[in-house]
Interface confidence: medium
């Protein structure tokens, strides 16, 4: 029995619902009483949802899954996963048994956009050209891990003396803190870009130092 799933990962934002597509080709005269359908986590074999003996056996996965009962008879064995979490990321296997047996695995990629970075400066007063300052760029609650880039006001990348740390919170979302140590020129703008590689999302933050006083651009 040929079971079909999408080749590409299904991408879902944290908090939204995802449909893990799975289909088979029922023969003429097929009855749901003949169908055994199991969704399980590919790696751990944990049961997620099942259909057997003509009945939806329900969710075994935090009550966040559902089948499409009206479409099962047409060969649509897709699974709806509600309120997606980071922990849901991974491979799900769809097993279909009528007389023959077939299975296929579909990958779920979870994503969350990063917040607009906040910028802090240490020290933040009495700054003079030649002083060494530490600029921190912080962006929150994204997934997966971000790529962080720094540049000066002319768009020249700043790669030296950058330290970036990413910490996952209890939901598995990452908070990113990137620290740039730089020797001040007469004045200058320093920008950080936090990129979500899955969503191709760019979040920008910048700080402008103009001798005294120092100004932060207003939030757009």
């Amino acid at each position: 029995l040929e079971v079909q799933v999408p080749e590409d990962p299904v991408v879902a934002l944290v908090g939204t619902d995802a449909t893990l597509c799975c289909s088979f080709s029922p023969e003429p005269g097929f009855s749901l009483a003949q169908l055994n359908l199991i969704w399980q986590l590919t790696d751990t074999k944990q049961l997620v949802h099942s259909f057997a003996e003509g009945q939806d056996q329900g969710s075994a996965y935090a009550n966040r899954t559902a089948l499409f009962p009206d479409l099962l008879a047409q060969g649509n064995a897709s699974l709806r996963l509600q309120r997606v979490r980071v922990a849901d990321e991974g491979s799900f296997t769809c097993f279909v048994s009528i007389r023959d047996f077939g299975s296929a695995a579909v990958s779920l990629q979870v994503a969350a956009p990063y917040s607009k970075p906040s910028m802090t400066l240490e020290p933040n007063k009495d700054l003079r050209p030649g002083d060494t300052v530490t600029i921190t760029c912080s962006s929150y609650r994204g997934y997966p891990e971000a790529e962080v880039f720094w540049q000066d006001g002319q768009g020249v990348p700043l790669t030296g003396n950058v330290t970036t740390s990413q910490m996952a919170n209890e939901q598995g979302l990452f908070d990113v803190h990137s620290v740039l140590r730089v020797v001040l020129g007469a004045n200058g703008t320093y920008s950080c870009l936090v990129r979500n590689p899955v969503l191709q999302q760019d979040a920008h933050g910048s700080v402008t130092i103009t001798g005294q006083p120092m100004t932060f651009p207003p939030e757009a």
Epitope: Q4, P6, E7, D8, V10, V11, A12, L13, V14, G15, T16, D17, T19, C21, Q109, A111, A112, P113, S115, K116, V198, L199, Q200, Q201, D202, A203, H204, A220
Partner: antibody, heavy 120, light 107 residues
Framework: EVQLVQSGAEVKKPGESLKISCKAS????????IGWVRQMPGKGLEWMGI????????RYSPSFQGQVTISADKSISTAYLQWSSLKASDTAMYYC?????????????WGQGTLVTVSS | EIVMTQSPATLSVSPGERATLSCKAS??????LAWYQQKPGQAPRLLIY???TRATGIPARFSGSGSGTEFTLTISSLQSEDFAVYYC?????????FGQGTKLEIK
């Protein structure tokens, strides 16, 4: 360069069927979502639905579910929007637009629009 | 479905001045919010996505902000070519609904 070229304007009678097209070029057709947006005369944009040509998976707005069918032909990099029985209220400009290679993306590139007029 | 509400319906601003357009979502959409510009007889054009990321080729005078349910599009110094209709769209969850539009007109 990404381009979406739509078929020409159509004038139809109520009850007739219609299939309009959107020919894509400049990118890998099978790996990006492509969708349709309606704009009735003098009104705003309405999201109708999208399709992933790679596997044919689609999503519809509840307002358009069962009213239209979105399909795609990978072999000629073309997406379609079709009606089996047109109504006067289907008179509108229809735009095709390409999203990203993941579903949660806005519409980056737009076709020039196809004007559909349904009148007896 | 998520309902998007834009305000004001019409905004009259003089060239060179700043324009601020608002968009509200009926429930949280994180930062999955896009802005489009449409001129008469033309297809819409993507300006901003992920609430604040400018699309390729969009001038720096266009900026977006917001998260959750409230979003803003700001045009810092209006040029003659900026007078058009602007739509917001949530791209958080299907159906990806649009707001009803804000017409930006010359004062």
């Amino acid at each position: 360069e990404v381009q979406l070229v739509q078929s020409g304007a159509e004038v139809k009678k109520p009850g007739e069927s219609l299939k309009i097209s959107c020919k894509a070029s400049g990118y890998t057709f099978t790996t990006y979502w492509i969708g349709w947006v309606r704009q009735m005369p003098g009104k705003g944009l309405e999201w109708m639905g999208i399709i992933y040509p790679g596997d044919g998976g689609s999503r519809y707005s509840p307002s358009f579910q069962g009213q239209v069918t979105i399909s795609a032909d990978k072999s000629i990099s073309t997406a379609y929007l079709q009606w089996s029985s047109l109504k006067a209220s289907d008179t509108a400009m229809y735009y095709c637009a390409r999203g990203g290679n993941y579903i949660s993306f806005p519409m980056y590139y737009w076709g020039q629009g196809t004007l559909v007029t349904v009148s007896s | 479905e998520i309902v998007m509400t834009q305000s004001p319906a019409t905004l009259s601003v003089s060239p060179g001045e700043r324009a601020t357009l608002s968009c509200k979502a009926s429930r949280g959409v994180s930062t999955a919010l896009a802005w489009y510009q449409q001129k008469p007889g033309q297809a819409p054009r993507l300006l901003i996505y992920w609430a604040s990321t400018r699309a390729t080729g969009i001038p720096a005078r266009f900026s977006g902000s917001g998260s959750g349910t409230e979003f803003t599009l700001t045009i810092s110094s209006l040029q003659s070519e900026d007078f058009a209709v602007y739509y917001c769209q949530q791209h958080y969850d299907t159906p990806y609904t649009f707001g009803q539009g804000t017409k930006l007109e010359i004062k």
